[in-house]
Each structure stands twice: as C-alpha cells, then as structure tokens.
C-alpha cells in the first residue's frame, strides 16, 4: 500500500498510468533531470497523456517513507547563478525582478479589491435575509440562536464590521440588550473566518499546497469554534464579559475620539467604487424592523444629495395629532397640520457600473459573486506563481528563517507573542482581518509561513480587528458611544480569553492539531473541504436556527443527544489512542461500525461516481476553452484534455502525436519532455501542478 492512501487507484483506470511515470517518482521536476528521454525501464518516452482530473504528476508522486507532508518545501533556485550572468543577463534579471514585484503588488491589489467586491456581492445576495435574522428579537434572547445568527449574518454579508454595526445600532435603540448581543458577536467572529477558508479552496490544485493552505485557513475557524464552545456556556452562566466590560467602561471615562485610519480603503475604494456601491443602511433598517426597507435596493444610485427642511402641510387623523395646536385646520374633509419635512434632493448619480442597470439586487449580486470569485481565483494563482518564482534560493531561505525561526533560548516563547502583535498591527493597518488572513493563506500554501507561525499571526489578526472596532466605537456619536464601546470591548475580551485558552501552553494549541487533521483529510478527499465549509458555516447554523425557532425544549431535545454522542465518540477515540488495553477488543478500533460510518472512502466513491457523470460534458468544454486559450496566448506547449473522447478516438490521436503548446506560466510537471527542455536558463516558476486538478470538486 502506498504511504498516501489517497493515491491508490488515483485514476478511474488504475492500470493506465502517465507514460514514463510508472515507477516511483522523484519529486524533482523533469526539467531538472538532464537525463535522456527514457523512463526507468529504458523505454523511450513519446509523450505524456493528460488524464481527467488526475493529470498532474503530483497525484502519482509518492512521498518517501518518513517524510512529513507538513515540512516546509525547499524552494530551490533552479536558475543561473548571479555570478555566472553577463551584464545583459544581470540587467534583464533586475528588470524581471522589478517587473515581478510590480505584478505581485498589482495582483495583490486586485486580490484585496475582489475581496471587497465579494463582500458586496454577498450582501446583495443575502443581505436582506441577514437583516431579517436580526429582526426576530424573541429568538435572539436565546444565546445559542444568537450565536448562529451571528455566524449566518456574517457569512451572508462577508463582513463582521457590518454585523457589528447592526448589533451596535440595535443595542443603542434598546432593541437588543448587551447580554443578548454578546453571543451574536461571538458568532460574527466565527463567520468572519469563512473568507480565508474560501481563499484556501482556490489552492486545491496541488495536494500538499492545499493541505497547508487549508489547514492554515481553518486554524482560524477552529480557534473561533473552540473558543465559543468554552466561552459561550461560561458567558451564559457567569456573564463575565458583560461584567468585565461594564467595569472597564466605569473605570475609564471614555471620550469621543478619532476613528482608525482607513489605509487600505483609501487605496482600494477608488477602484471598487467604480464596480459597485452599496447603501449599507438598508440592511440596518431591516434589522431594526423597518418594513419599508424590504423594498429598497441595496445598490446605491445617488451619491450626492442635499437635504432641504421645508414646512409642509400634512394630513393627520385628528386635531389631537397636530404637531402644533396653532397650526392645525380642516378643509372640511381632512385635518391638516404644518410639519417640518426633511426632503432629500438627489443631485449626482454614483459612478459605478450598475448605476444605470435596473437589475434586481440578486442578479447584480450573482454577477459580482461570479466575477469576484474568478478574479480572486486568478489573482491567487498569479500571486502563488509570482511568489514561487521570486521566493527561491537565498531569498526564500532568509524569508522562511525570519518568519518561522524562534528567538534564542530562553526567549523562544516570546516569538509567538511577537507574532500575535505583528498580526494585530497588520490587521489594524489594513482594517480587515479577512484581508490579512486571506493574504496569508497562499503564503502558508506555498510553504513560506508554517502553520505554527500562522496560528499566532491569525490570533493577532483577531485582536487587531477588535482594536479597530474599539476605535470605531470611540468615534461614534454620543448616543451610541457606550453601547458600541461595550460591544467592541466584549469582542476584544472574547478574543483575549480565547488566546488565553488556546495559546500560552503548547499542549492547548488544539486548533493547530485539528487544522492539520482537517488539512490531511482535505488533501486526501478534496471534496471534504467544500463539505466542511457548507456544513459548518451554513448547514449547522441554519439547523440550530431552525431548532431555535421551534423553542428551547426542541433545541435541547435534539442538541443534547447529539452533543452527548459526540462526547462519547471523543472519549472513545481518546481511550483508543491513549490506553486501548482497558477497552474491550471490539472497541479498540472502529471496525465494529459499517465502513461508511468510520471512513470517507465509501463517500468518496459516491462523490467520484457523481462527478464522473459531469466530467465527460465538462471536459469537452474544458478542452475547447484550453485550446482557445492556447491560441490566444500563442503558447509554446499546451496539452488539452481528451477526457471526453471515446477510447478509439484517443488511440487515433495518440498515433497522430500532435502536441499542443502551452505557456510556461502554466507549467505542469506532468507535461511532455519536449516542452520541459525549453528555457532551462529561466528561473523556474512554481508549478501550478495541473490546473485540471481543480476539477476534483
């Protein structure tokens, strides 16, 4: 059996291997092997055949026994050494370096902008529904329901600051107590961690890269879920956050201050405002129970308007309703009074794409969601590739050492805390934990940052986003100052409590172990990553919310047995792991259960079966797209999948042996040797390791 079970029968036809790859593969790309075009058996390699969904070399790559997939990869510089280059080569190299750096900044800018647009898209698609979750006050007094509302709303609007500002408004207008708002804030904290998990999905092309990226992203999720798991019952029992924040507010007499500097927004807003502008007040009005807001569009049409206060004659039901007794009369039919009416006069329309389209919010939302995800994915691929080509040799060594090395003994323990401060500082600068953690995800994926270092950076990011909220609260008007400050402080102390729980003692750094476990599963069964995302961020919160609607007895009746079962499984797992001897023989493993209950293999088979049905149709489309791209790019070496052909047709084409050229930008280790020999002198760009792997989903 292979050391990586996911590689067993990696193809629908196990007997059909990539030519010239039948033996155990080394992880060094074929480019680096100056060997003649023969395989291990000495047979000449004619060409490489790409097979559907499993066409990358990475899938048949077997890790030598004893290697840890979590070890950071060596990013070797395969290019010509600096000393060996002539003046022209050096100049070209400098220009290339500067060009790559500019491109990197450009893609990073587009990446951040697409995250902003993605948030707007989510608000257009689910913002009104999210607002309605908040308007059900009776449910929100239940802390568990409050928690899931916080999760759902933040997932739907892709912005914890939006959900926080709704909560602040509701507390300020006495629609919600601070006690009821705390679980919602906890939920918002969980909801905000979905963004970098979505970003991690974009790196599914390479199993090991995906393993690291997904673990790096979900370490945030696990920290938040585990913190809530401990702190929500604690808060429900003791109200420590409410008491502590009250104490802080009474001890320090807070004055209105300046808001946090919006450094990133200043750069991204000019671009994102050309794409879409939203009227965030609409969601807030819906949450506050304003039924009229339901029919309003979230898309901002007018950006400049003036407010005129004019005296207007308005009808009232009777003279008792007159605003001023001296200004009240009847015309014999209606009773009138004079009122100061504030009229908004629109002057200038906004300058975004959708301003003149009378499309419904949902349609615009879906368009933007699609476009922003495509741009996000594209930018991520390009960032990963550019970083891969830049971070090599000396540069990689220096960066990796700087980021992942601890302080010398006895101060090694301080490194993590410094990372927390760095994470908090960076988040404070960019004003968004989502942006910071999402930008960090590809770096974890390519192995520049280790999971162990990403964890404190993420925790710091959580702190950073709350300090931003505190500053925003200090800048809020007098009537909402106290409530917004108390909620921001609750958020802050919740994260501090979480850090105290899951960071100081290495043994308690459970989120790292859980994230690595999930990373391993997701690398083996990539569909599980999508399942995890849907299950934990949508299905579970929606189920809990539905049960909350039914009332406490139903929620407890269904929830308690499930929790007890989970605890039982957990205890049994611990005993199996720690001291199996005390267990009866049958309980020492999970084999007493049907396979589908303790293994993902049967589920994987079902999903593989389902995806294969779509694959034939999908591959035809992919091949056409691939060919068009090759033609447009004028690529040198491009092979397009033949997965939708019949066996006979494939054989025919094999005989013809017409390779299609593809650009080096999309290097594929499984490509034919004739492509790989070209451009040996170039600095090797990190392989995308077969785009076709993304079809695993």
């Amino acid at each position: 059996m292979a050391p990586w079970p996911e590689l067993e029968n990696a193809q629908p036809n196990p007997g059909k291997f990539i030519e010239g790859a039948s033996g155990p593969q080394s992880s060094i790309p074929a480019k680096d092997k100056e060997a003649s075009k023969t395989n291990d058996n000495g047979t000449p390699v004619a060409k490489t055949e790409l097979l559907p969904s499993y066409s990358a070399l990475v899938l048949i790559e077997e890790h030598p026994e004893g290697t840890d997939p979590w070890d950071l990869p060596e990013l070797q510089d395969t290019g010509i050494k600096w000393s060996e280059r002539d003046t022209k080569g050096k100049t070209l190299c400098i220009f290339q370096g500067v060009g790559k750096f500019i491109l990197l900044l450009g893609f990073l800018y587009l990446f951040v902008c697409s995250l902003d647009v993605l948030s707007s898209a989510f608000q257009l698609v689910g913002g009104k529904v999210a607002g309605q979750f908040f308007s059900n006050n009776s449910i929100m007094s239940n802390p568990v329901a409050g928690l899931v509302i916080g999760v759902l709303v933040t997932v739907m609007v892709q912005s914890s600051s939006t959900s926080s500002s709704i909560i602040v408004s509701m507390v300020a207008s006495s629609l919600l107590t601070v006690r009821a708002a705390i679980p919602i804030i906890m939920g918002a904290n969980i909801g905000t961690s979905i963004t970098n998990t979505i970003v991690a999905l974009m790196q599914a092309g390479d199993r090991n890269e995906f393993r690291r990226a997904f673990a790096g992203a979900t370490v945030h999720d696990f920290f938040n879920w585990l913190s809530v798991f401990v702190l929500l019952p604690l808060e429900a029992a003791t109200h420590y956050l409410e008491i502590l924040t009250n104490l802080v507010l009474e001890t320090f007499k807070f004055q209105n201050g300046e808001d946090a500097p919006d450094i990133l927004k200043v750069i991204t807003d000019p671009f994102t405002k050309l794409i879409i502008q939203l009227d965030k007040k609409v969601i807030q009005q819906i949450a506050m129970g304003d039924s009229a807001a339901q029919n309003k569009s979230l898309i901002k049409i007018w950006c400049k308007s003036i407010t005129n206060v004019t005296e207007m004659n308005v009808t009232v039901p009777s003279t008792d309703n007159c605003t001023s007794p001296s200004y009240c009369w009847t015309d014999g039919i209606q009773t009138w009074t004079i009122q100061n009416v504030t009229q908004k006069e629109n002057i200038a329309k906004c300058q975004h794409i959708f301003v003149n389209f009378s499309l419904p919010d949902l349609a615009v939302g879906i368009i933007l969601l699609t476009v922003s995800l495509v741009v996000l994915c594209g930018c991520l691929i390009m960032i990963v590739k550019l970083l891969g080509s830049v971070l090599r040799g000396q540069v990689a060594t220096v960066i990796k050492k700087t980021l992942n090395t601890d302080f010398p003994f006895p101060f090694a323990w301080l490194t993590g805390y410094l990372a927390i401060l760095v994470g908090a500082g960076m988040t404070f600068i960019v004003q968004s934990s989502s942006v910071f953690t999402s930008a960090m995800t590809p770096l974890i994926g390519i192995g520049v940052i280790s999971i162990e270092r990403a964890y404190p950076l993420t925790l710091g990011s959580n702190i950073g986003t709350t300090t931003t909220a505190i500053l925003a609260a200090l800048a809020s008007p007098g009537n909402t100052l106290r409530s917004s400050l108390q909620i921001a402080l609750c958020h802050f102390f919740f994260n501090i409590s979480g850090i105290l729980l899951w960071y100081p003692i290495p043994f308690t750094r459970l989120p790292i172990r859980l994230a690595k476990g999930l990373g391993n599963i997701s690398a083996k069964y990539r569909w599980f990553a999508v399942f995890y995302l849907i299950f934990f961020f949508f299905v579970t919160p929606l189920t809990v919310f539905g049960l909350s609607l039914a009332g406490w007895p139903v929620l407890v009746g269904v929830g308690v047995p499930i929790i007890l079962l989970l605890l039982l499984v957990l205890c049994l797992r611990m005993l199996q792991f720690r001291c199996p001897r005390i267990l009866p023989l049958k309980l020492r493993d999970w084999n007493f259960l049907p396979l589908w209950m303790h293994s993902l293999k049967p589920w994987d088979n079902v999903i593989s079966l389902a995806t294969t049905c779509f694959q034939r149709r999908c591959c035809c489309c992919c091949r056409v797209c691939c060919r068009v791209c090759c033609m447009v790019c004028g690529c040198k070496c491009c092979r397009c999948s033949k997965c939708c052909r019949d066996q006979g047709e494939e054989e025919e084409e094999k005989e013809q042996d017409i390779p299609v050229k593809a650009s080096g930008a999309f290097d594929n280790a499984a490509m034919s040797k004739e492509c790989q020999d070209e451009g040996k002198g170039q600095v090797e760009v990190l392989s995308m390791k077969a785009l076709s792997n993304t079809t695993v989903f």
Partner: antibody, heavy 120, light 107 residues
Framework: QVQLVQSGAEVKKPGSSVKVSCKTS????????IHWVRQAPGQGLEWIGG????????NYKQNFRGRVTLTADKSTSTAYMELSSLRSEDTAVYYC?????????????WGQGTTVTVSS | DIQVTQSPSSLSTSVGDRVTITCTAS??????VAWYQQKPGKSPKLLIY???TRHTGVPERFTGSGSGTDFTLTISSVQPEDVATYFC?????????FGVGTKVEIK
C-alpha cells in the same frame, strides 16, 4: 379668470330630489375641494359637505348624511350636489365654493347660488 | 360641533368710522378662522383667512386678529361699498361652522 357657474333655480315638491350643478373654469379642478353651503332666507350660512374631485373623497355634515350626495366629473370640471327627500325647510340658496386642497386659505371663490324652493 | 357666536348682529355706522365685529368660538380653534363679506343679493366673498391673512384684492382697511377663541374683524375706515353682512367661520375641526352674521349699515 376663476369662475364657478351654477345651474338655474329649481322648484320642487316635498319628498322629491334636486340635483344642482357647479361648472368650474379658470383653475385646476383636481387641485381644489368643492364645498356646498346653503343659506335659508334671512338666515346665516350652513355648510353641507365637500368633495375632493381628484379622488372623490367626500365628507358631509351629520344632519345631511344619507340625504345628500356629492359627485364630481373631472372631464367637464363640474361638481354636483343631489339632495333627496326634500322638505319645506330645505328651501334656500345653495352655493358651491372652492377651497385649495392642502391649504388653509378657506373658501376663496363662490358660485352665484342656486335657489331651491320646496313647496306643495 | 364648534359653535360660533358673532356680535353684534347688526350695526349702523358712518362713512370713515372704525368698525369692530367680534366672533367667539365655543372651543380653541387656534387661528383657523375666516371672515366673509356678503353684499345683498350676492354670494359671499372671502376677506380674511387664518385669522389675520388678507385675501388677494381685499382693501387694507380690513384687518383680522385674534387666536384661540376670540377673534375680531376691524374696518378701519368704513366706505359706502362696505355695506354688507359679515360672517366668521371656524375651520379647526369638521364640520365647518359659520357665525350668524353681522349686518353693517351706513347711517
């Protein structure tokens, strides 16, 4: 100029009905309320009711409800008042008057009046 | 219904004299009071609305004042064409109600 021209004098028998018209010109009919006021010989003015021609909303004085019907024809800018179950005490001069809708300027223009005599 | 009482019911004056007609409402009507002039054999004409606002084309000798329950119409210098019956009307609440009228004559 603003004009409210009423129909001619009517002589009616008790128990019958009378329909008085008020044709307007010189202003936007739908922007005003048309009121009907009567004046018995040697007496003061008594308000009967009013109609908003724009939406046909009406209001009547309590003691006329059920006996009076106010209507308006926007196409001809004409208002009508029909009074049924006539009694001798309904003998009076009936006036139509306009009142600017949503304004407190009172009845700023009146018709010339229609004399309705009820006798057996 | 709001009752409107007018006094005097009639008065005789000389050209150039100052004449004051009073109107009392049975309850507070704010300033929702209008004054009308009706010459013999003619239809009424609006003089004053909102207690003190002169209607367009009304001579300046006619002034209205008051608020709450007590209102007055003053003709600062009576002219021969001012011979008429003057009515006050409240329009604070429905139904609209009129005073019985004050008949002004010239000696």
């Amino acid at each position: 100029q603003v004009q409210l021209v009423q129909s001619g004098a009517e002589v009616k028998k008790p128990g019958s009905s009378v329909k008085v018209s008020c044709k307007t010109s010189g202003f936007f009919f739908t922007e005003y309320i048309i009121h009907w006021v009567r004046q018995a010989p040697g007496q003061g003015l008594e308000w009967i009711g009013g109609i908003i021609p724009n939406n046909d909303v009406t209001n009547y004085k309590q003691n006329f409800r059920g006996r009076v019907t106010l209507t308006a024809d926007k196409s001809t800018s004409t208002a009508y008042m029909e009074l049924s179950s006539l009694r001798s005490e309904d003998t009076a001069v009936y006036y139509c008057a306009r009142w600017r809708n949503a304004y407190y300027s009172a009845m700023d223009s009146w018709g010339q009046g229609t004399t309705v005599t009820v006798s057996s | 219904d709001i009752q409107v009482t007018q006094s005097p019911s009639s008065l005789s004056t000389s050209v150039g004299d100052r004449v004051t007609i009073t109107c009392t409402a049975s309850q507070d009507v704010g300033t929702a009071v209008a004054w009308y002039q009706q010459k013999p054999g003619k239809s009424p004409k609006l003089l004053i609305y909102w207690a003190s606002t002169r209607h367009t084309g009304v001579p300046e000798r006619f002034t209205g004042s008051g608020s709450g329950t007590d209102f007055t119409l003053t003709i600062s210098s009576v002219q021969p064409e001012d011979v008429a019956t003057y009515f006050c009307q409240q329009y604070r609440t429905s139904p609209l109600t009129f005073g019985v009228g004050t008949k002004v004559e010239i000696k």
